[in-house]
């Protein structure tokens, strides 16, 4: 027989020859960090075939780790549901604790012996301090010193000093989160106050309000023989300034009795056309409107804005 | 507090021009919108229009064509332009800050008075 | 434009009675009129915003009500300052507009 086979949990005892005689038995040895569990045989033989009879490492068991617990408020997963050396183990914290500690250890063998890459981590109970405070506004639980994980509280903001209230910008209820951190930053309190919104042959529908507050809508609509110019929708942001602008209505033009003129493309920018609000620099885009929303009107001429009565 | 003035009224032919001034004082011009207002007997109160903090203006069609608001903020002072001015137009004209963005008039001055007659 | 119509032109009350002035507008305004009220010599005062709001320093014997199109300033005790001539204003339509006022005289 050639050389008999190898193995990766035993290895030969003595030095392999270049061939051997029928008969000849060579026997193994479980290899460093494997240990033997009989009956199974760790020897073999070369056969009148001139090959070697069956045999496999079976026998040979991997050094495994020491058991590891679940740590309190966690668990200790085996990455392949195995302590054998050359393998980890994987730490996970149950909902509302944090690990303090390595998430994986390793298994490793030490001269002969498998040991763990270190100590088993702990899982702590995720707290919080106290959120922050805001100007103008309050939160609930302002005693507590030590919030738990999901432990919630809701910011309200001060009465005003003056004839405006102060509004809520952002979430008014917070969270103890995961990593110690609270789920959002803090909310703000603020008097948002948008400007009395003027539309020019056209006038609001909806939302209608004494003063418009943060989150106001306001719904318009043109004049016959105008189309609105802007979106029929605009509401008040945190920067007291209307969302989308304040818009515009411009004037249909008459249908004309011959073939339209070329367009000049330019804009005559008529102060009364100005709105309040409507700062933004330069022209604003005139749009036409869909013939259909206009039974009787043409396609306005791009570019023409005017709003006399 | 800013106080408004209002100058420049007097007597006037039909058809000339008047330039009325509204100067503002305990603030700046510009950080408020400025409406104009007419009051005679015979027409009572009247809104001519509006030049606001961004510098458009909004005006009343009946007097579109014939007024103009302006501003001139290193002046500190709104104006009202009046041309080709008519016998009706006689009246006591009112410079009135907006009330804080929104269309109540709780500013009055004392107006000034125009009247037109040959 | 939008109208405005004041009733009644004109009212002679004694001192301690209740005074009541309607406005009424051509089209539905919301609740967009203010008061204002033009003393002998004076330049007009604002009384009342957005139909019931007292504006800051105006006594609570001034009252506003109403929405749409009709609205309603009472005097609940007329007090003999409260002379003088009371217009109605809407806001909620360019141009802004004035009734053609309401003289309220003490007997």
């Known amino acids: 027989c050639e050389e008999p086979p190898t193995f990766e949990a035993m290895e030969l005892i003595g030095k392999p020859k270049p061939y051997y005689e029928i008969g000849e038995r060579v026997d193994y040895k479980c290899k460093k960090g494997y240990f033997y569990i009989p009956p199974l045989a760790t020897h073999t033989i070369c056969d009148r075939n001139h090959t070697w009879l069956p045999v496999s490492d079976d026998a040979c068991y991997r050094e495994t780790c020491p058991y590891i617990r679940d740590p309190l408020n966690g668990q200790a997963v085996p990455a392949n549901g195995t302590y054998e050396f050359g393998y980890q183990m994987h730490f996970i914290c149950n909902e509302g604790y944090y690990l303090i500690g390595e998430e994986i250890l390793y298994c490793e063998l030490k001269g002969s012996v498998a040991i763990w890459s270190g100590k088993p981590p702990i899982c702590e109970k995720v707290l919080c301090t106290p959120p922050p405070k805001i100007k103008n506004g309050k939160h609930t639980f302002s005693e507590v010193e030590v919030f738990e994980y999901l432990d919630a509280v809701t910011y309200s903001c001060d009465p005003a000093p003056g004839p405006d209230p102060f509004s809520l910008i952002g979430e008014s209820t917070i969270y103890c989160g995961d990593n110690s951190v609270w789920s959002r930053a803090a909310p703000e309190c603020k008097v948002v106050k948008c400007r009395f919104p003027v539309v020019e042959n056209g006038k609001q529908i909806s939302g209608f309000g004494k003063k418009f507050y943060y989150k106001a809508t306001v719904m318009f609509e043109c004049d016959k023989g105008f189309y609105l110019d802007g979106s029929d929708t605009i509401v008040c942001d945190s920067n007291s300034t209307w969302d989308p602008p304040v818009p515009k209505c411009l004037k249909v033009l008459p249908p004309s009795s011959t073939k339209p003129p070329a367009l000049s493309h330019s804009v005559s920018t008529s102060s009364t056309t100005k709105s309040p609000a409507s700062s933004a620099s330069g022209p604003r885009p005139t749009y036409k409107p869909p013939v259909s929303n206009y039974p009787g009107y043409p396609k306005p001429e791009e570019g023409i804005l005017d709003s006399l009565d | 507090e800013v106080q408004l003035v209002e100058s420049g009224g007097g007597l006037v032919q039909p058809g000339g021009s008047l330039r009325l001034s509204c100067a503002a004082s305990g603030g700046s011009v510009s950080s408020y919108d400025i409406s104009w207002i007419r009051q005679s007997p015979s027409r009572g109160l009247e809104w001519l229009g509006v030049?606001?903090?961004?510098?458009?203006?909004n005006y009343n069609s009946a007097f579109m064509s014939r007024f103009t608001i302006s501003r001139d903020d290193s002046k500190n002072t709104a104006y009202l332009q009046m041309n080709s001015l008519k016998t009706e137009d006689t009246a006591v004209y009112y410079c009135?800050?907006?009330?804080?963005?929104?269309?109540?008039?709780?500013?009055w001055g004392q107006g000034t008075l125009v009247t037109v007659s040959s | 434009a939008i109208q405005l119509t004041q009733s009644p032109s004109s009212l002679s009350a004694s001192v301690g009675d209740r005074v009541t002035i309607t406005c009424r507008a051509s089209q539905g305004i919301s609740n967009y009129l203010n008061w204002y009220l033009q003393k002998p010599g004076q330049s007009p005062q604002l009384l009342i915003y957005?139909?019931?709001s007292l504006h800051e320093g105006v006594p609570d014997r001034f009252s506003g009500s109403g929405s749409g199109t009709d609205f309603t300033l009472k005097i609940s005790r007329v007090e003999a300052e409260d002379v003088g001539v009371y217009y109605c204003q809407q806001y909620i339509k360019l141009p802004w507009t004035f009734g053609q006022g309401t003289k309220v005289e003490i007997k």
């Open positions: 957005y139909t019931s």
């Open positions: 009135e800050r907006v009330y804080d963005g929104y269309p109540w008039f709780a500013y």
């Open positions: 030049i606001w903090t961004d510098g458009g203006t």
